[in-house]
Interface confidence: low
Amino acid sequence: LPAQVAFTPYAPEPGSTCRLREYYDQTAQMCCSKCSPGQHAKVFCTKTSDTVCDSCEDSTYTQLWNWVPECLSCGSRCSSDQVETQACTREQNRICTCRPGWYCALSKQEGCRLCAPLRKCRPGFGVARPGTETSDVVCKPCAPGTFSNTTSSTDICRPHQICNVVAIPGNASMDAVCTSTSPTRSMAPGAVHLPQPVSTRSQHTQPTPEPSTAPSTSFLLPMGPSPPAEGSTGDFALPVGLIVGVTALGLLIIGVVNCVIMTQVKKKPLCLQREAKVPHLPADKARGTQGPEQQHLLITAPSSSSSSLESSASALDRRAPTRNQPQAPGVEASGAGEARASTGSSDSSPGGHGTQVNVTCIVNVCSSSDHSSQCSSQASSTMGDTDSSPSESPKDEQVPFSKEECAFRSQLETPETLLGSTEEKPLPLGVPDAGMKPS
């Protein structure tokens, strides 16, 4: 170690180093002083004189100890979708970050070069993963038993309320409506809003969509109307469902007894058992506007009653592409104008053990006045215990539905609800919704 401190400029000992905040000038072959942050080298050192520093001019800076001849230029002013989180000074560059509701689609060394608005999930879809400073929102379709009725970048799918008596069953974009009794929730709703990201991070991480929790049958078509909101199977409590089932069973027995009595009176009613045919639409038709449902009548034996464990209360299959399934006997595929029904029964995912029992009882009470048949059908609602995870998807099952159900469905699912508005996305910078794989 030298006995006394050397003052710059000085010639370093062979093999030794210049000290911190000094640099080695090749021309002078001396250790010279660096300039402090906010300054630059106006005159380089010589063998006899040290570096002469000068302050950076406006809109320029140096952040480190340096010996550069010119200060660095500050970045351009922040754009309208950005917030200036660090002003340009002589010692630091301007830093722009995205304002709330936007994310950084293209980052730079510090701050953000290009911001894009966070995707908004439309009704029937909820936030699967919230947006961050550097990644877009990921939407997923609301699973059976949950709904989202907002267009939002923060709202998740919420559970339907459970009613003692249901006025209108809930669907993916609408909560259940109860009749004048206090409803309960099927599960704790939790936080409806996800926290809005605060843009502070400057290091860019590539948005990587996490494995989707959306059903594997879901799809997102790039053009045309968005896939309508998901099916409207009600999420009812099991005891209520049992009561409905037992009642329906009772009505079925009454119908059978009634028909037996008619037979004994030896009147022969011509009772037409009405059964709607379920079309087998290709995937591209399933997306279009639904035409009027056609009733194809099948003549069955008098006094017959049919009961089915398939659900007829569920709405049109909103998302799933048609799977090629064998048609049930007597139910052949028909014209393009017909709707397609699907059950709301769910596969339990590894995480959720949920059962959903769908009961449909169609009871035909046949009276034989004037040898004409008056068949009244009683249709039950779906009942179930959907303690299930969002990854469940409705099974595509083709089932008959009665005329009453057609009327009931048309109240709920007008063309406006079926043809949901397309998801607004001003900049095509975000990743596709995880799980929303194009078919």
Partner: nanobody, 122 residues
């Protein structure tokens, strides 16, 4: 455009060693200096070690790392190395490679690597 690519970070026990390397590529006109800075959360980046151009290739080190860290450079590859020995828990940080380059007009330009995490923990 100049790119700085770092490697060599990781988890090491106290007293252990790591060797960081940083390769500069792209349109390099002239290098004023290359070195390493480090940053821990909620604190400013601090200089760890730096090599400046010169006949004797003088080095600069932060007091906290003197005698433990050694910076070196391969001029042919435009690569700088930081050999870190006798590592301490307080050396845990994100280490950034830094290059101060001269542009064609003589102006100096800062370039930074993406950073590599060094964690010293038992």
């Amino acid at each position: 455009q100049v790119q700085l690519v770092e490697s060599g970070g990781g988890l090491v026990q106290p007293g252990g060693s790591l060797r960081l390397s940083c390769a500069a590529s792209g349109s390099i006109f002239s290098i004023y200096a290359m070195g390493w800075y480090r940053q821990v959360p909620e604190k400013q980046r601090e200089l760890v070690a730096e090599i400046t151009e010169g006949v004797n290739t003088p080095y600069a080190y932060a007091d906290s790392v003197k005698g433990r860290f050694t910076i070196s450079r391969d001029n042919a590859k435009n690569t700088v190395y930081l050999q870190m020995d006798s590592l301490k828990p307080e050396d845990t940080a994100v280490y950034y490679c830094h290059a101060l380059l001269a542009g064609p007009g003589g102006g100096g330009y800062d370039y930074w690597g993406q950073g590599t995490q060094v964690t010293v923990s038992s």
